[in-house]
Interface confidence: medium
Amino acid sequence: LEVQVPEDPVVALVGTDATLCCSFSPEPGFSLAQLNLIWQLTDTKQLVHSFAEGQDQGSAYANRTALFPDLLAQGNASLRLQRVRVADEGSFTCFVSIRDFGSAAVSLQVAAPYSKPSMTLEPNKDLRPGDTVTITCSSYQGYPEAEVFWQDGQGVPLTGNVTTSQMANEQGLFDVHSILRVVLGANGTYSCLVRNPVLQQDAHSSVTITPQRSPTGAVEVQVPEDPVVALVGTDATLRCSFSPEPGFSLAQLNLIWQLTDTKQLVHSFTEGRDQGSAYANRTALFPDLLAQGNASLRLQRVRVADEGSFTCFVSIRDFGSAAVSLQVAAPYSKPSMTLEPNKDLRPGDTVTITCSSYRGYPEAEVFWQDGQGVPLTGNVTTSQMANEQGLFDVHSVLRVVLGANGTYSCLVRNPVLQQDAHGSVTITGQPMT
């Protein structure tokens, strides 16, 4: 039986639906009751979808596949794959059995366009001709890995002193960070191009650097000294302010928020316009307050991964910057207490008491005490495991030898929130008979 599939890979954008074409030539008198159709992953042989005994047997692949039932009788065995993910990339085999048997494999090539690159400079103030500057070009959420090119204002490729890293996120999409180190001339334009080799999609950005010939007074940028504490899932405001001079207009303002350590762009306001969030679309400025010198940043739906230092750069004619720390926190749940063994307990028995508290941040401090308020420090083992969101589950185990009876309390303290969660258990040992 001849089974036909396209020779070229099917290219599908992440999040869209893809059709993996497969066809066969039914003989006269063919009925669907005769058809056995199986789609499977070519390499692992994992079942994806099947049609047997005259019936669509449904999706075995995360409920994201479908056949074209109205077209099967005409020999169309194509498979619809919904909401394509990076992990779907690969070869799918279409097996068709009527009386005879045939199969063919079709390749799925997944792709995602890269964002317009953001450009950051380090250092970014008091630049003079002859200074070495590091220019970082960052582009996000593309697939597959990008090709990155740099060039100067005359279109000359820059290949020396370029370091490019590409990191895949949980969805398999790549964030590209390319760093160019250059020695400044009188002034210069540097451009970075991020090319998606599958989509032949180009995303590029430029930065023009005009070094100062003489030092000027810096803009005074003010941020809070203490870290901003934000609960996971809530919104946080990273305060930053500057003092605008008389006659100041937003057209003069360049405002950049970036991660202090990695120089990743978070949000920017340039050329009189809010350039939007470059940070998972979870940041916003306060546009109505900018003209009064309020350059604060709103960070929405705070995650553990947001914790760290954010730098607020303000450039008008002069330049200034300051860093504000974000401390993320999440309260711990009321501890649950378990005993092992938990029956037929007698004075003198050794018992293990486990105190468990969940989904807190940062790591907890754990304390035990007995019914008289005496701290228990010996024979305590505490483990803290972070989940995918970075939140900690705490399990603390106390081993004690029972007296006639006793109360044992465990306290789980969040050191940032100064939040205490405690649980206790009272054990009454049965007398010896």
Partner: antibody
Framework: EVQLVQSGAEVKKPGASVKVSCKAS????????MHWVRQAPGQGLEWMGG????????TYNQKFKGRVTMTRDTSISTAYMELSRLRSEDTAVYYC??????????????WGQGTTVTVSS | DIQLTQSPSSLSASVGDRVTMTCSAS?????MHWYQQKPGKAPKLLIY???KLASGVPSRFSGSGSGTDFTLTISSLQPEDFATYYC?????????FGGGTKVEIK
């Protein structure tokens, strides 16, 4: 129609200078970088450098640095290449060539007809 | 500098022949571009970015390759294809051309 029209042939003595012009038409002159390439008789192509008409910024092949000067006059959409201290091995056809439109197109999509420069005593 | 070596330096072929020429770079390049030049004329862009056909160029011309080895193929040689073909790179400065492959009538 996009065209690059170059000035006529030149005969020069060793030690002299030559200035070749290249007039662009059919497109916006300042949107494309202009380069110069030469070809000695019976030889291959040799890149000399380029000029960004928008900024006047230049890039030169090290081999010609100090002898070549590229300029432009945006008012008449014309690029110039001047080569000084000529020697007999500079005898060649000199071409202006337009770099591809995209900032990252590293090839030449339109060429002038060429200007023959002969250096002879 | 990146040196580009074209081979063969010349070849003889008949109309209708399939013709292949290569360009070898002394170190890896991102893209290769190809030009055709006829005697007394300026070069003409044929293939850019390794495999893309320039505007107005017949589909019998194709390019391929990556890294250091690139190929220009003419699937069925026509009378107007007898010319010299040059490869060019600008992945690193300075921009360089190959020495050329001259395609002559057999």
């Amino acid at each position: 129609e996009v065209q690059l029209v170059q000035s006529g042939a030149e005969v020069k003595k060793p030690g002299a200078s030559v200035k070749v012009s290249c007039k662009a038409s059919g497109y916006t002159f300042t949107e494309y970088i202009m380069h110069w390439v030469r070809q000695a008789p019976g030889q291959g192509l040799e890149w000399m450098g380029g000029i960004n008409p928008a900024s006047g910024g230049t890039t030169y092949n090290q081999k010609f640095k100090g002898r070549v000067t590229m300029t432009r006059d945006t008012s008449i959409s014309t690029a110039y290449m001047e080569l000084s201290r000529l020697r007999s091995e500079d005898t060649a056809v000199y071409y202006c060539a337009r770099k591809g439109k995209d900032y990252f197109d590293w090839y030449f999509d339109v060429w002038g007809q060429g200007t023959t420069v002969t250096v002879s005593s | 500098d990146i040196q580009l070596t074209q081979s063969p330096s010349s070849l003889s072929a008949s109309v209708g022949d399939r013709v292949t020429m290569t360009c070898s770079a002394s170190s890896s390049v991102s893209y290769m571009h190809w030009y055709q030049q006829k005697p007394g004329k300026a070069p003409k862009l044929l293939i850019y970015d390794t495999s893309k056909l320039a505007s107005g160029v017949p589909s019998r011309f194709s390019g391929s390759g990556s890294g250091t080895d690139f190929t220009l193929t003419i699937s069925s040689l026509q009378p107007e294809d007898f010319a010299t073909y040059y490869c060019q790179q600008w992945s690193a400065s300075p921009l360089t051309f190959g020495g050329g492959t001259k395609v002559e009538i057999k």
